[in-house]
């Protein structure tokens, strides 16, 4: 999902946190979409 950044050591060291953040934001987006859907 971030091919070029993988050459940076930082990407490797933060990978777990990045994945956590992505999962969280996907959850938040899904919840937001649900709220929007429910209000229609």
């Amino acid at each position: 999902d971030n091919p070029s950044l993988s050459i940076d050591l930082t990407f490797h060291l933060l990978r777990t946190l990045l994945e956590l953040a992505r999962t969280q934001s996907q959850r938040e987006r899904a919840e937001q979409n649900r709220i929007i859907f429910d209000s229609v």
Partner: antibody
Framework: QVQLVQSGAEVKKPGASVKVSCKAS????????MKWVRQAPGQGLEWMGV????????FYNQKFKGRVTMTVDKSTSTAYMELSSLRSEDTAVYYC???????????WGQGTLVTVSS | DVVMTQTPLSSPVTLGQPASISCRSG???????????LEWYQQRPGQPPRLLIY???NRFSGVPDRFSGSGAGTDFTLKISRVEAEDLGVYYC?????????FGGGTKVEIK
């Protein structure tokens, strides 16, 4: 060659905000995270946070969370660090830095002195 | 946070003689990938820091071979085999294995 050129020195009043810029050249800006480190006069180095210029992911040192905002402008290959609610203890030289595939802070900007004084 | 403690605070040296700086971490800084992300930086007066050593013992490009790093777990050392005038300044150890990333307090290498 990799170059990180920072904005000039600033003098601010307590309570104000400051925005420091860091213009990158000599490499593909979106290939490397940008970090910010500060150094109070005569003191050691303190990591403030890191931003992914590609996706915008940001990780702040908890110590600065809520007061620091890191952003990038991909069109100009420039990273920004804004610190709000300034106090005298924020008087420091602020550095941007970039890593490599092997180390976290391989290239550094020249530093920006921010003086907070009433 | 991982506290990085450097000793001595100041190291008075004679040019041409060796110097040694110690860095101790408050907990193991072996990353979950089995690497130890311990780096050493040199800062000359009025300049930004400069990377010397990464992953405990690897010299960064352009760093003279009189600089060497060693150690494991929580105890690390930076050695300068023969100090030259251009080596004077402050040296910092740094750990990147645990967030927040932390630096040691610095060791000033100065002329005796």
């Amino acid at each position: 060659q990799v170059q990180l050129v920072q904005s000039g020195a600033e003098v601010k009043k307590p309570g104000a905000s400051v925005k420091v810029s860091c213009k990158a050249s000599g490499y593909t800006f979106t290939d490397y995270f940008m970090k910010w480190v500060r150094q109070a006069p005569g003191q050691g180095l303190e990591w403030m946070g890191v931003i992914n210029p590609n996706q915008g992911d940001i990780f702040y040192n908890q110590k600065f969370k809520g007061r620091v905002t890191m952003t990038v402008d991909k069109s100009t290959s420039t990273a920004y660090m804004e610190l709000s609610s300034l106090r005298s203890e924020d008087t420091a030289v602020y550095y941007c830095a970039r890593g490599t595939d092997r180390a976290l802070f391989a290239y550094w900007g020249q530093g920006t002195l921010v003086t907070v004084s009433s | 946070d991982v506290v990085m403690t450097q000793t001595p605070l100041s190291s008075p040296v004679t040019l041409g003689q060796p110097a040694s700086i110690s860095c101790r971490s408050g907990q193991s800084i072996v990353h979950s990938d089995a690497n130890t992300y311990l780096e050493w930086y040199q800062q000359r007066p009025g300049q930004p820091p400069r990377l010397l050593i990464y992953k405990v013992s690897n010299r960064f490009s352009g760093v003279p071979d009189r600089f060497s790093g060693s150690g494991a777990g929580t105890d690390f050392t930076l050695k300068i085999s023969r100090v030259e005038a251009e080596d004077l300044g402050v040296y910092y150890c740094f750990q990147g294995s645990h967030i927040p990333w932390t630096f040691g307090g610095g060791t000033k290498v100065e002329i005796k």
